[in-house]
Interface confidence: low
């Protein structure tokens, strides 16, 4: 037996009669033999679940589960239910009505065994039927809506005549009908104004009813329509099986590249047009086990369980179901060496089905694994500024398809030829298996017998120690010009282009910081801000090269606090700021500030200023001060 | 089986803000009211603030209104817990817990811990 | 806001010993008052609501009365897992509060 709702609402006025009826709860079987039978808690509850009083004032016919008063609710006990209440008005109570057999105790109120009905109380009696308005002659205040259970008997689920209308005001005539569709299963008796199923509802055919209650009301020569929604939702059970969509019960997969524990391999998916067990129960009643195969495969494989709700059309409605993506996943990394093929099987059980038929599918994946090879290009050339400053980032390595590589570790090294000249450095990218190639030491680029550079790059996996070897040939080019006094480490301090733009820092590669212009649109992740080289710094992603040190990109590797507007990274720098952002490593300290200068004026004398030095002074630049364009604006 | 994780806890300067989550599962979320527990290190329960099944009515102690603010996302069975204005007396475990129909908390989390620290 | 006050704070007892620890509210709480035991390191653990109700799971040597000001939380005869903290907590309006603990210890 269940409830057709969770919940009721009727009016309660003071000194309404005893006797007077107050509304009918419902109860639909399960089973075609079951008889409800109504019971009430013992309590009246008040405003957030406050326990008032006992329960001496209304009462419950058991079998039909009329609610009626048994003794007028008089000021007097009123006041003395408020006086409980926690402070707050009383203006709702509840009472818990429960379907036999029950346990006796009263605790958690939950459908289907378990009903609330709410009073809405008013502190005047019973108002002159004459005042009624058609809408408080014809139906709660509060819309009712109702859950019915599928493949269960048909039965009543409600009953529209408000009762203490019809009890108090005789002499006002209420008529109901429902508006429906064709060859819906519902009907409302004329006489009982009972609504009631007509057969067994199947919620994989329709899970919403959204139909319209019409109620007109006669009194006197008056006649009102009064119409309100009447929505009935369709309760599922598990009396689908699982299939599979389009008859696909084999994933073919090969595990290459991507070897790392937690990759996907391949997925199957399952369609249930159940949406039951509910979410919190799924996975334990939704079971899926990989059989059992050889050692090697129970330890690598593994098989997860994603279930999704889904919506599909069935006789031009839609009603929900759920996909279940069973995905193939690796439980660790892969040796490069390993190299073999396999059948693994699933067995997927829908524990809850009852039939006919089986609620279990068996799931196949055919996985090859093939053996990766260490390859690199036979030489790499490339150029250095003589400018360039320390972690100067100025090109990578990667072994043949290491963009690819996941869960595969490849060390580089750079051994040099000449012992004097070791001036670069590489370090190997957790992003993406390459080695990026940096300026370690600048004092070797100086020397002129240092203007190529030759090393031989290798390339280990040092679990199965496989190598691979390439030639590199750097040029260091251009004339060393030392740097303006005062200019600080990192280019991140600056907050002007002007600055900026006439020092260097640390990670330069040209031995001068640039200007990132931002675009001006409030927070964004394009900032205006100083950085040693705009292809690397900020790009929201603090590399393995910005982390030796902190005064390369602040932006993106800093830890500390972040002043004024900005959206920080995760979990470090500054994913997006207003305006110019500037840092200072050392203080661990970045501000976010709007731009200095905005009016259209400095926009055209930027531009004036521009074309000036690119033109008439060929690329010797000569820079305006903040003092001249405040004059520029004075004048 | 009912179950409440908290999450978000963590080491914070006074002054700072940080907001705590907690995921429920095996309950009908929306039926029941929320509240915020915590307990600083060596003391005692200290009830922080309360929320209605819908949302719509929260409740706080007087010493953290305007700074504490409870929330709940009905369609995620997660509540919240956003604190402004961290004072180094806000260090504590943080424990969400589900009340039942008489009030009291019949399930809590395993609790989050907050440190307010220079 | 509605004070619980517990007494005793600390409470040194033996395996089998009866114990009862007292919860006074500052103002008529009627029998909304609940009772939760914690262990160290853990979240607490509710054994008695509405004053007198035994949560369920919660074994019968332990037990609650009282009304309106005064509560007690008796546990008849003591075991080792009975070792722990004990809270009082009022369920009569908000804020709710909790009492300040009393500490069980083995003697």
């Known amino acids: 037996l269940y409830f057709s709702r969770d919940a009721y609402w009727e009016k309660l006025y003071v000194d309404q009669p005893a006797g007077t009826p107050l509304l009918y709860v419902h109860a639909l079987r399960d089973a075609p033999e079951e008889v409800p039978s109504f019971r009430l808690g013992q309590h009246l509850y008040g405003t957030y679940r406050t326990r008032l009083h006992e329960n001496n004032w209304i009462c419950i016919q058991e079998d039909t589960g009329l609610l009626y008063l048994n003794r007028s609710l008089d000021r007097s006990s009123w006041e003395k239910l408020s006086g409980r209440n926690r402070g707050f008005p009383l203006l709702t109570v509840y009472l818990k009505v429960f379907l036999s057999p029950t346990s006796l105790r009263e605790g958690e109120c939950q459908w289907p065994g378990c009903a609330r009905v709410y009073f809405s109380f008013f502190n005047t009696s019973f108002p002159a039927c004459t005042s009624l308005k058609p809408r408080e002659l014809c139906f709660p205040e509060t819309r009712p809506s109702f859950r019915i259970r599928e493949n269960r008997p048909p039965g009543t689920f409600h009953q529209f005549r408000l009762l203490p209308v019809q009890f108090l005001c005789p002499n006002i005539s209420v008529a109901y009908r429902l508006l429906e569709g064709e060859g819906l299963p519902f009907r409302c008796a004329p006489d009982s104004l009972e609504v009631s199923t007509r057969w067994a509802l199947d919620r994989e055919q329709r899970e919403k009813y959204e139909l319209v209650a019409v109620c007109t009301v006669h009194a006197g020569a008056r006649e009102e329509v009064v119409m309100v929604p009447f929505p009935v939702t369709v309760y599922d059970e598990d009396d689908s099986a699982p299939t599979f969509p389009a008859g696909v019960d084999t994933a073919s997969a090969v595990v290459e590249f991507k070897r790392k524990e937690d990759t996907v391999v391949a997925t199957l998916r399952v369609f249930d047009a159940d949406v039951v067990p509910a979410s919190g129960e799924l996975v334990r009643r939704y079971t899926s086990t990989l059989l059992p195969g050889d050692t090697w495969t129970q330890q690598t494989f593994r098989v997860e369980h994603w279930p999704n709700e889904t919506s599909v059309q069935a006789n031009g409605s839609f009603v929900r179901a759920t996909v279940h993506d069973y995905r193939l996943v690796l439980n660790r990394n892969l040796s490069i060496s390993e190299n073999r093929t396999m059948q693994l099987a699933v067995l997927v059980n829908d524990s809850d089905f009852q039939g006919p038929g089986a609620g279990v599918l068996l799931l196949h994946f055919n996985v090859s694994v093939l053996p990766v090879s260490l390859h690199l290009p036979s030489s790499y050339s490339l150029s250095v500024s003589r400018r360039a400053r320390r972690f100067a980032q100025i090109g990578k390595v990667c072994v043949e398809n290491c963009q690819a590589f996941s869960g595969i570790n490849v060390q580089y090294e750079l051994h040099s030829s000449g012992a004097n000249c070791s001036t670069l450095g590489v370090v190997t990218s957790a992003e993406d298996t390459s080695g990026i190639l940096f300026v370690n030491d600048t004092k070797a680029l100086r020397r002129p017998k240092c203007a190529e550079l030759h090393y031989m790059v290798v390339a280990t996996n040092h679990q199965t120690s496989r190598q691979a070897q390439a030639q590199l040939l750097v040029t260091v080019e251009g004339l060393y010009v030392a740097e303006e006094a005062g200019c600080p480490l990192s280019c991140a301090v600056s907050k002007r282009r002007p600055e900026c733009e006439e020092c260097g820092g640390l990670g330069s590669p040209t031995g001068r910081c640039e200007w990132r212009q931002g675009d001006g649109k409030g927070i964004t992740r394009n900032f205006s801000t100083c950085s040693p080289s705009t292809k690397t710094c900020p790009d929201g992603h603090c590399d393995v090269v910005e982390t030796q040190d902190i005064n390369i990109c602040p932006q993106d590797c800093l830890r500390g606090s972040i002043v004024g507007g900005h959206e920080p990274g995760e979990p470090r720098g500054i994913k997006a700021g207003y305006g110019t952002c500037n840092c200072f490593p050392e203080e661990e300290k970045c501000f976010c500030e709007p731009e200095d200068i905005q009016d259209p004026l400095c926009d055209e004398l930027c531009r004036e200023q521009k074309l000036i030095s690119e033109e008439d002074l060929g690329g010797e630049q000569k820079l305006i001060s903040e003092e001249d364009l405040h004059h520029h604006h004075h004048h | 089986e009912v179950q409440l994780v908290e999450s978000g806890g963590g080491l914070v300067q006074p002054g700072g803000s940080l907001r705590l989550s907690c995921a429920a599962s095996g309950f009908t979320f929306t039926t029941y009211f929320m509240s915020w527990v915590r307990q600083a290190p060596g003391k005692g329960l200290e009830w922080v603030s309360g929320i209605s099944g819908s949302g719509t009515s929260t409740f706080y102690v007087d010493s953290m209104k305007g700074r504490f603010t409870i929330s709940r996302d009905n369609s995620k069975n997660t509540l919240y817990l956003q604190m402004n204005s961290l004072r180094v007396e806000d260090t504590a475990v943080y424990f969400c817990?589900?009340?039942?129909?008489?009030?009291?908390?019949?399930?809590w989390g395993q609790g989050t811990l907050v440190t307010v620290s220079s | 806001d509605i004070q619980l006050t517990q007494s005793p704070s600390f409470l040194s007892a033996s395996v089998g010993d009866r114990v009862t620890i007292t919860c006074w509210a500052s103002q008529d709480i009627s029998s909304h008052l609940a009772w939760y035991q914690q262990k160290p390191g853990k979240a607490p653990k509710v054994l008695i609501y509405d004053a007198s109700t035994l949560q369920s799971g919660v074994p019968s040597r332990i037990s609650g009365s009282g009304s309106g000001t005064e509560f007690t939380l008796t546990i008849s005869s003591l075991q080792p897992e009975d070792f722990a903290a004990y809270y009082c907590?009022?369920?009569?309006?908000?804020?709710?509060?909790f009492g300040q603990g009393t500490k069980l210890e083995i003697k």
């Open positions: 907590q009022q369920l009569d309006g908000y804020p709710y509060t």
């Open positions: 817990a589900k009340e039942n129909t008489y009030g009291h908390f019949d399930f």
